[in-house]
């Protein structure tokens, strides 16, 4: 029998490499059974997670899962860092694992890496292929 506890499916050690100036959606996959929990995003500052007020968020509902999305429109250099989503469920606070955004400032990288650059710098290819991951259903 499946548990009806709320689950926040942010994977441990998850990372995203993104460019300043681009739009980006940070997804918190939320599983719940009956009433949708109240979910918030916070940004880690040392050991404290500072709640993100006045930020654009939205819900995307799918068949077996919902996504609470934090919108970056656009991404700014100081968006670099680690984020966590939290859900209030039956008086319990459930916290996700943290997910880290690595923001490349377009001023210091005046253009996106070319295919040749990606081939000669495999760590870039790894970051873009492996970390810049979205859920597709």
């Amino acid at each position: 029998k499946e548990s009806c506890d709320v689950q926040l499916y942010i994977k441990r050690q998850s990372e995203h490499s993104i460019l300043a100036g681009d739009p980006f959606e940070l997804e918190c996959p939320v599983k719940y059974c009956a009433n949708r929990p109240h979910v918030t995003w916070c940004k880690l500052n040392g050991t404290t997670c500072v709640k993100l007020e006045d930020r654009q968020t939205s819900w995307k509902e799918e068949k077996n899962i919902s996504f609470f999305i934090l919108h970056f429109e656009p991404v700014l250099p100081n968006d670099n860092g680690s984020y966590r989503c939290s859900a209030n469920f039956q008086s319990n606070l459930i916290e996700s694992h943290s997910t880290t955004l690595y923001v490349t400032d377009v001023k210091s990288a005046s253009e996106r890496p070319s295919k040749d650059e990606m081939a000669s710098r495999p760590w870039l290819l790894y970051r873009h292929h492996h970390h810049h991951h979205h859920h597709h259903h």
Partner: antibody, heavy 121, light 112 residues
């Protein structure tokens, strides 16, 4: 009941590509949170984690072997496939697959029986 | 990479007596989420590994309570309160806090 079973060639030649299949039951990689890892163990030596694939096709690799590894899943067949290129005699090992989910608490809670792969000309 | 160092590498024990295995890591295994992803595996002769303990001290289902895990930060211990014949094998610690996940070199427990 969760079970995993590895299959593939027992002998490969140096420079060849190894393809191993992990067939599992009792859980599904279409379920949010699920994942499968590959781990190997050379004869008489310690374990080494190789690669992991999650339900959403996110993949993690051991950086020391990343350039040689590919991991894929076939959700409908309940299978995960590992390929390792340019095999060398030092890659002779028992290769295991094991289950592990997104939150770290069920990392490697179930293991396959392992399959011994010998690399020799 | 985080290096996991176990000691001793070989542990001859008397049936019914206690046994203790140490595992040290080169970095703290306390994660930012407050959990410590330090786990212990048992590998009996000719068998695949089996998870005994996860998150430092939580016993897997079916694991006898003579096994216990403790520790924090970089120093961890697996204890067997009274060794039985079926406990013979190699014990590995491994960490899932830092990427890539790494294992200790193993401790072989045998009966004197």
């Amino acid at each position: 009941q969760v079970t995993l079973k590895e299959s593939g060639p027992t002998l490969v030649k140096p420079t060849q590509t190894l393809t191993l299949t992990c067939t599992f039951s009792g859980f599904s990689l279409s379920t949010f949170g699920m994942g499968v890892s590959w781990i190997r163990q050379p004869p008489g030596k310690a374990l080494e984690w190789l690669a992991h694939i999650y339900w959403d096709d996110d993949k993690r690799f051991n950086p020391s072997l990343k350039s040689r590894l590919t991991i894929t899943k076939d959700t409908s067949k309940n299978q995960v496939v590992l390929t390792m290129t340019n095999m060398d005699p030092v890659d002779t090992a028992t290769y295991y697959c094991a289950r592990g989910n997104w939150d770290g608490e069920t990392y490697f809670d179930y293991w396959g029986q392992g399959t011994l792969v010998t690399v020799s000309s | 990479d985080v290096v996991m160092t176990q000691s001793p590498l070989s542990l001859p024990v008397t049936l019914g007596q206690p046994a203790s295995i140490s595992c040290k890591s080169t970095q703290s295994l306390l994660d930012s989420d407050g959990k410590t992803y330090l786990n212990w595996l048992q590998q009996r002769p000719g068998q695949s590994p089996r998870r005994l303990i996860y998150l430092v001290s939580k016993l897997d289902s079916g694991v006898p309570d003579r096994f216990s895990g403790s520790g924090s930060g970089t120093d961890f211990t697996l204890k067997i309160s009274r060794v039985e014949a079926e406990d013979v094998g190699v014990y590995y610690c491994w960490q899932g806090t830092h990427f890539p996940w790494t294992f200790g070199q193993g401790t072989k427990v045998e009966i004197k």
